[in-house]
């Protein structure tokens, strides 16, 4: 089953995915796609990196983290209800059937219409602990259990700025993380 993340219409959605490069600058190709991970690569690719840089992207989809350090979390800008669905993060580790696949489910909720006097917005995300397994079936990600939902109402940074907060750093070890080498 896919891990679930939530955002509101008009917000930026954040889908976490990390790996630890074997050495600084020793990057692994990564793709993000709309739809569950297929056998090879990603279906309906929205963003792709190679060993050096982001080499393909589509509008509204970007990597806000430091992908050179393995933070390949996807930010989707100004989401609409149509952005709901499953997204695939695939870390293409060289070797024989070494790819790591993560299916993340994005749920978009209608925007709250209550007036807000401040510029702060709500962002609630569940950061699950992930166990990755090497296997030959489609389900190579198993959820061990989610941490409690974390309400970031008090934090003025938006979801796409989470990586800069100490909280996000604490959560990094709980997300979809792969160590290479």
């Amino acid at each position: 089953s896919e891990v679930e993340y939530r955002a509101e219409v008009g917000q930026n959605a954040y889908l976490p995915c990390f790996y630890t490069p074997a050495a600084p600058g020793n990057l692994v190709p990564v793709c993000w796609g709309k739809g569950a991970c297929p056998v090879f690569e990603c279906g309906n690719v929205v963003l792709r990196t190679d060993e050096r840089d982001v080499n393909y992207w589509t509008s509204r989809y970007w990597l806000n983290g430091d992908f050179r350090k393995g933070d390949v979390s996807l930010t989707i800008e100004n989401v609409t209800l149509a952005d709901s669905g499953i997204y695939c993060c695939r870390i293409q580790i060289p070797g024989i059937m070494n790819d790591e696949k993560f299916n993340l489910k994005l749920v978009i909720k209608p925007a709250k219409v209550t007036p807000a006097p401040t510029r702060q917005r709500d962002f609630t995300a569940a950061f699950p602990r992930m166990l990755t397994t090497r296997g030959h079936g489609p389900a190579e990600t198993q959820t061990l259990g989610s941490l409690p939902d974390i309400n970031l109402t008090q934090i003025s940074t938006l979801a796409n700025e989470l990586r800069d907060s100490r909280l996000a750093n604490d959560l990094r070890d709980s997300g979809a993380t792969i160590r290479i080498g």
Partner: antibody, heavy 123, light 107 residues
Framework: EVQLVESGGGLVKPGGSLRLSCAAS????????MTWVRQAPGKGLEWVAS????????YYLDSLKSRFTISRDNAKNSLYLQMNSLRAEDTAVYYC????????????????WGQGTLVTVSS | DIQMTQSPSSLSASVGDRVTITCRAS??????LTWYQQKPGKSPKLLIY???TLAEGVPSRFSGSGSGTQFTLTISSLQPEDFATYYC?????????FGQGTKLEIK
């Protein structure tokens, strides 16, 4: 015009080895995943192995990965399948196929196929 | 492994007939399904990918539908050149697997 031409098939004794080749032309070979699919006489299609653009990632039918090795030489526009410890059940026509690809798609289906090369394993 | 089961295994029809071939997956494969056509002594030809997208150069009388575990290939009006064997293939789970084929013969 896209062309895939397999070679290297033939008659081999059980336990023997063969190396199949696939010469590609008419497209930028290094932009595509490549795949081997086989078809035993009178039977259906069976996926054998696939390889990514630069050869760093390979994928195999589990029962074959200890005996078969897929590789590619992008400088020569060539795909290879090294087959060791061959068995009678490996007898088949072996097809080389190109994974359909553009930047926004995944190469999980095959838009061009070679004519196939017959491998017969028999004593 | 994901099993792909096609029905019928063989089918007799006439030119002009509407024909439907079914492919069932043993588990959810979303829309990750491809259809190929193969004529005797020839290599397979890509017809439809992602369950319903027509490959380049394929006549519009071919169509695909379905998602999850149930898929269909429909030929709206059979032409003489359509008599062949048809295979479905899933590309969701490793290994890639094909259906056993449906042989379409002239009645």
């Amino acid at each position: 015009e896209v062309q895939l031409v397999e070679s290297g098939g033939g008659l081999v004794k059980p336990g023997g080895s063969l190396r199949l080749s696939c010469a590609a032309s008419g497209f930028t070979f290094s932009d595509y995943y490549m795949t081997w699919v086989r078809q035993a006489p009178g039977k259906g299609l069976e996926w054998v192995a696939s390889i990514n653009y630069d050869g760093r990632n390979t994928y195999y039918l589990d029962s074959l990965k200890s005996r078969f090795t897929i590789s590619r030489d992008n400088a020569k526009n060539s795909l290879y399948l090294q087959m060791n410890s061959l068995r009678a059940e490996d007898t088949a026509v072996y097809y080389c196929a190109r994974g359909y690809y553009y930047y926004g798609s995944s190469p999980n289906y095959f838009d061009y196929w070679g004519q196939g090369t017959l491998v017969t394993v028999s004593s | 492994d994901i099993q792909m089961t096609q029905s019928p295994s063989s089918l007799s029809a006439s030119v002009g007939d509407r024909v439907t071939i079914t492919c069932r997956a043993s588990e959810n494969i979303y829309s990750y399904l491809t259809w190929y056509q193969q004529k005797p002594g020839k290599s397979p030809k890509l017809l439809i990918y992602n369950a319903k997208t027509l490959a380049e150069g394929v006549p519009s009388r071919f169509s695909g539908s379905g998602s999850g575990t149930q898929f269909t290939l429909t030929i709206s009006s059979l032409q003489p050149e359509d008599f062949a064997t048809y295979y479905c293939q899933q590309h969701y789970g490793t290994p890639l697997t094909f259906g056993q084929g449906t042989k379409l013969e002239i009645k």
